[in-house]
C-alpha cells in the first residue's frame, strides 16, 4: 500500500481467482484513542472499532472511502483504491491501446517545435468517475523540471457503437535549450482513477523523437506563362523554432484529386517554392519535416488548384 | 544577426556539402547497425545515450545561433577561448566566436574518428564479421575535417592488449553511433546557419 | 497486371514522320500519366515529354517541341507519339511508360525501334 | 536543364560482392531522384523512387541513398542477375533528365 496523495492510498493486488488480498491497517487520523468507530462508502455498518481497522482487501468491494468517527462527528478520512496485476502485468483497463506507432502505445505525445512544450494525449470509452494526474521529468535517477497542466477531455468521437473521449495534456520543460542535444529522456507519468480502479501509464521519448511541425503557412499559387506548371510559395509555420536558417525543415509538395488512388504529381524540396502540374479539381498540398533530423510529417496545408 | 545575410550558395560555405554528406553517412551506417544486429540493443530505446566529447569540447555551446544566446537556458557553460585559423571561414569579418565553433566541430570529428577506428580494428577481428564501419562514413569524416582545415595534435590510436569482447564492442558500436549522429544533425544546422550568414 | 504493349519496329527516311502507338491494359488508362523516352543504340534514355491522358495536357521537353506530339485515344486505351522531321540521329529505341506518379517511370512497355536511314 | 553525371560509367564486381553507384546532380535536387536497371534488349525497370524508398518486387539487397547533389545506388551482394546498366534519373524539375549511366559486369 502507499499513499498516493493526502488521505488517499493505492492497495496493489495480485488478482487471480481466490487471491489472499492484502492485509491493510488503516489508522484514524485524530488525537482520540476511545469511542472510535469506522464505516465504508454511504453504508452505516459499523466495519470495527478503535484507533485503527484491519482489513483484508481482496476486491473491489473491499475499496472505498473509510471514514472513523466518534459520536456521530466524522474524525477523518481514507479512501483505497486498488491496484490489478493480472500474470504479473499491471492492468491497463482504464485507457485505449492506441497501437501506434506500435503495441501497447497509451500514450502518445508530439512537439511542434524545440522549445521544451510538448503535448500527450490519450483515449478511453469511459465517461465517467473519471480522473487523471500528469508529472513529467527530464531524466529518471535525477530528474530535472518538467511542468504540466491539468488534463482537458479534448475531444469526442463515435466509434462503431462506442463514444471514444480524448484527454491531452501540455507540458514544457522547465529550463530548455532547443539547440541542446538530448541525453536523457522526458518521462511523462498518467495516474488514471476510475471509481476505485487505480492505473498508471508511462512515456518515455527525446523531444527530438517527437516533433511534428505545424503545416506550412500563406500557400500560393503563380501560374506560368503558356505552360501548365505553377509556383506555389509558402512560408515556415509561425511555431517553428527560429532561426530557420539553423532550424531548418524541408517540404513535400503534392498535387492530387480527392481520391488518394487519383494520379499525383509530387516534389521534394528544401526551398520555399515549388513548380508543379497543376489539374482542375485537383488540390495543392505542402507539408514540412525537420530536414536534418526525420521524425514525423506535419499535416498537409491545401489550397485548390483553381 | 551581426553577419550579412548572403543568398545560400554551396560554393560559398564549402563545409556546408561535407556535413550534409557526414549526416547522411552516419544516417546510413547506423540504419545499417541497426539491420544488422537485429539481435543486439542498438535502437534508440534500449541505449544508454553517452557523448564521448562531454566535457572535452562545447560544440551546441560554441555554435550556439546568435538568435538563441538571449537564452538563458543555452547559456549554461559557454566558453571563451577561440582558435581563428580554419578554411572554412567565408570571410574576414568571421567572428572569433565562429572560429571557435568550426574548431570545436574538429576537435568532435578528430575524437570520433579515434573511437571508430580503434573499434573497426577490433570488428575486422571477429570471427563472425557481422559488421564493419563503413569506409565512405570514415572517408566522409575525413574530407570534412580537411575542409575545416585546424591544425590540432595527432590523438594516437588506441590499442588494446587484451582480447576484444565482441558483444560489447558492436554496443559501443550502436551507442557511438546515436551519438555521432546527434552531433552531425548539430553540425549540419550549424553549417546551414553559417552558410545563411 | 499492368502492361504496355508498342506497335512493331520502323524504318523510315530522313524528313518522314513516324507514329508509334502504347496499348495499355490493367487498370484504367486515364488514371496514369503517359511518357515517351527513347534511347539511341549504344546510348542511355532521353525523356521526350508526356500526356494526362484523362484531359489531354502535354508537355514536351524542350529538345523534342515543335517536332513531337503525344497523343492518347480512351475509347482504345492507346496512346501515340508522332515525331515529324527525322534525321538519323532519331534512329532509337522508343519506349511509352507510365506511372500514377508524375515524374518517374514505374510499368514500361517492350520498346519499339525505329530506324532513320536514306 | 539539369544534368546527371554518373560514376563509374564501367563497375567491374565480383559476384557475391558488393557493388556502390554514384550519381551526381550539377544542382540540388533534395530527394527528386530514381534509380533503374535495364538489362540488354529489354526495358528499363524501377528499382528505388526518391533517392531510397524500395519498391514492392524489388529485392531488398537493393537500396539507395542521399539528398542534395549525391546519391549512391548500393548492392549488398551481386547475384548473377544483377549484371545490366544502371540509370539515375531526377524528377526536381522538368525536362526529366537520365545520368549516362553504368554498366556492372563480371569481374
Known amino acids: 500500500i502507499w499513499e498516493l496523495k493526502k488521505d488517499v492510498y493505492v492497495v496493489e493486488l495480485d488478482w487471480y481467482p481466490d487471491a489472499p488480498g492484502e492485509m491493510v491497517v488503516l489508522t484514524c487520523d485524530t488525537p482520540e484513542e476511545d469511542g472510535i468507530t469506522w464505516t465504508l462508502d454511504q453504508s452505516s455498518e459499523v466495519l470495527g472499532s478503535g484507533k485503527t481497522l484491519t482489513i483484508q482487501v481482496k476486491e473491489f468491494g473491499d475499496a472505498g472511502q473509510y471514514t472513523c468517527h466518534k459520536g456521530g462527528e466524522v474524525l477523518s478520512h481514507s479512501l483505497l483504491l486498488l491496484h490489478k496485476k493480472e500474470d504479473g502485468i499491471w492492468s491497463t483497463d482504464i485507457l485505449k491501446d492506441q497501437k501506434e506507432p506500435k503495441n501497447k502505445t497509451f500514450l502518445r505525445c508530439e512537439a511542434k517545435n524545440y522549445s521544451g512544450r510538448f503535448t500527450c494525449w490519450w483515449l478511453t470509452t469511459i465517461s465517467t468517475d473519471l480522473t487523471f494526474s500528469v508529472k513529467s521529468s527530464r531524466g529518471s535517477s535525477d530528474p530535472q523540471g518538467v511542468t504540466c497542466g491539468a488534463a482537458t477531455l479534448s475531444a469526442e468521437r463515435v466509434r462503431g457503437d462506442n463514444k471514444e473521449y480524448e484527454y491531452s495534456v501540455e507540458c514544457q520543460e522547465d529550463s530548455a535549450c532547443p539547440a541542446a542535444e538530448e541525453s536523457l529522456p522526458i518521462e511523462v507519468m498518467v495516474d488514471a482513477v476510475h471509481k476505485l480502479k487505480y492505473e498508471n501509464y508511462t512515456s518515455s521519448f527525446f523531444i527530438r523523437d517527437i516533433i511534428k511541425p505545424d503545416p506550412p503557412k500563406n500557400l500560393q499559387l503563380k501560374p506560368l506563362k503558356n505552360s501548365r506548371q505553377v509556383e506555389v510559395s509558402w512560408e515556415y509555420p509561425d511555431t517553428w523554432s527560429t532561426p530557420h536558417s539553423y532550424f531548418s525543415l524541408t517540404f513535400c509538395v503534392q498535387v492530387q484529386g480527392k481520391s488518394k488512388r487519383e494520379k499525383k504529381d509530387r516534389v521534394f524540396t528544401d526551398k520555399t517554392s515549388a513548380t508543379v502540374i497543376c489539374r482542375k479539381n485537383a488540390s495543392i498540398s505542402v507539408r514540412a519535416q525537420d530536414r536534418y533530423y526525420s521524425s514525423s510529417w506535419s499535416e498537409w496545408a491545401s489550397v485548390p488548384c483553381s | 544577426r551581426n553577419l550579412p545575410v548572403a543568398t545560400p550558395d554551396p560554393g560559398m560555405f564549402p563545409c556546408l556539402h561535407h556535413s550534409q554528406n557526414l549526416l547522411r553517412a552516419v544516417s546510413n551506417m547506423l540504419q545499417k547497425a541497426r539491420q544488422t544486429l537485429e539481435f543486439y540493443p542498438c535502437t534508440s530505446e534500449e541505449i544508454d545515450h553517452e557523448d564521448i566529447t562531454k566535457d572535452k569540447t562545447s560544440t551546441v555551446e560554441a555554435c550556439l545561433p546568435l538568435e538563441l544566446t538571449k537564452n538563458e537556458s543555452c547559456l549554461n557553460s559557454r566558453e571563451t577561448s577561440f582558435i581563428t585559423n580554419g578554411s572554412c571561414l567565408a570571410s574576414r569579418k568571421t567572428s572569433f566566436m565562429m572560429a571557435l565553433c568550426l574548431s570545436s566541430i574538429y576537435e568532435d570529428l578528430k575524437m570520433y574518428q579515434v573511437e571508430f577506428k580503434t573499434m573497426n580494428a577490433k570488428l575486422l577481428m571477429d570471427p563472425k564479421r557481422q559488421i564493419f564501419l563503413d569506409q565512405n562514413m570514415l572517408a566522409v569524416i575525413d574530407e570534412l575535417m580537411q575542409a575545416l582545415n585546424f591544425n590540432s595534435e595527432t590523438v594516437p590510436q588506441k590499442s588494446s592488449l587484451e582480447e576484444p569482447d565482441f558483444y560489447k564492442t558492436k554496443i559501443k558500436l550502436c551507442i557511438l553511433l546515436h551519438a555521432f549522429r546527434i552531433r552531425a544533425v548539430t553540425i549540419d544546422r550549424v553549417m546551414s546557419y553559417l552558410n545563411a550568414s | 497486371q499492368v502492361q504496355l504493349v508498342q506497335s512493331g519496329a520502323e524504318v523510315k527516311k530522313p524528313g518522314s514522320s513516324v507514329k508509334v502507338s502504347c496499348k495499355a491494359s490493367?487498370?484504367?488508362?486515364?488514371?496514369?500519366?503517359l511518357h515517351w523516352v527513347r534511347q539511341a543504340p549504344g546510348q542511355g534514355l532521353e525523356w521526350m515529354g508526356w500526356?494526362?491522358?484523362?484531359?489531354?495536357?502535354?508537355e514536351y521537353a524542350p529538345k523534342f517541341q515543335g517536332r513531337v506530339t503525344i497523343t492518347a485515344d480512351e475509347s482504345t486505351s492507346t496512346a501515340y507519339m508522332e515525331l515529324s522531321s527525322l534525321r538519323s540521329e532519331d534512329t532509337a529505341v522508343y519506349y511509352c511508360?507510365?506511372?500514377?506518379?508524375?515524374?518517374?517511370?514505374?510499368?514500361w512497355g517492350q520498346g519499339t525501334l525505329v530506324t532513320v536511314s536514306s | 536543364d539539369i544534368v546527371m553525371t554518373q560514376s563509374p560509367l564501367s563497375l567491374p564486381v565480383t559476384p557475391g560482392e558488393p557493388a556502390s553507384i554514384s550519381c551526381r546532380a550539377s544542382?540540388?535536387?533534395?530527394?527528386?531522384l530514381h534509380w533503374y536497371q535495364q538489362k540488354p534488349g529489354q526495358a528499363p525497370r524501377l528499382l528505388i523512387a526518391?533517392?531510397?524508398q524500395s519498391i514492392s518486387g524489388v529485392p531488398s539487397r537493393f537500396s539507395g541513398s542521399g539528398s542534395g547533389t549525391d546519391f549512391t545506388l548500393t548492392i549488398s551482394s551481386l547475384q548473377p542477375e544483377d549484371f545490366a546498366t544502371y540509370y539515375c534519373?531526377?524528377?526536381?524539375?522538368?525536362?526529366?533528365?537520365f545520368g549516362q549511366g553504368t554498366k556492372v559486369e563480371i569481374k
Open positions: 526518391f533517392a531510397s
Open positions: 534519373q531526377q524528377s526536381n524539375s522538368f525536362p526529366l533528365t
Open positions: 500526356i494526362d491522358p484523362e484531359n489531354g495536357d502535354t
Open positions: 490493367g487498370g484504367t488508362f486515364s488514371d496514369y500519366y
Open positions: 511508360a507510365r506511372n500514377k506518379e508524375l515524374r518517374y517511370f514505374d510499368v
Open positions: 544542382q540540388s535536387i533534395s530527394i527528386n
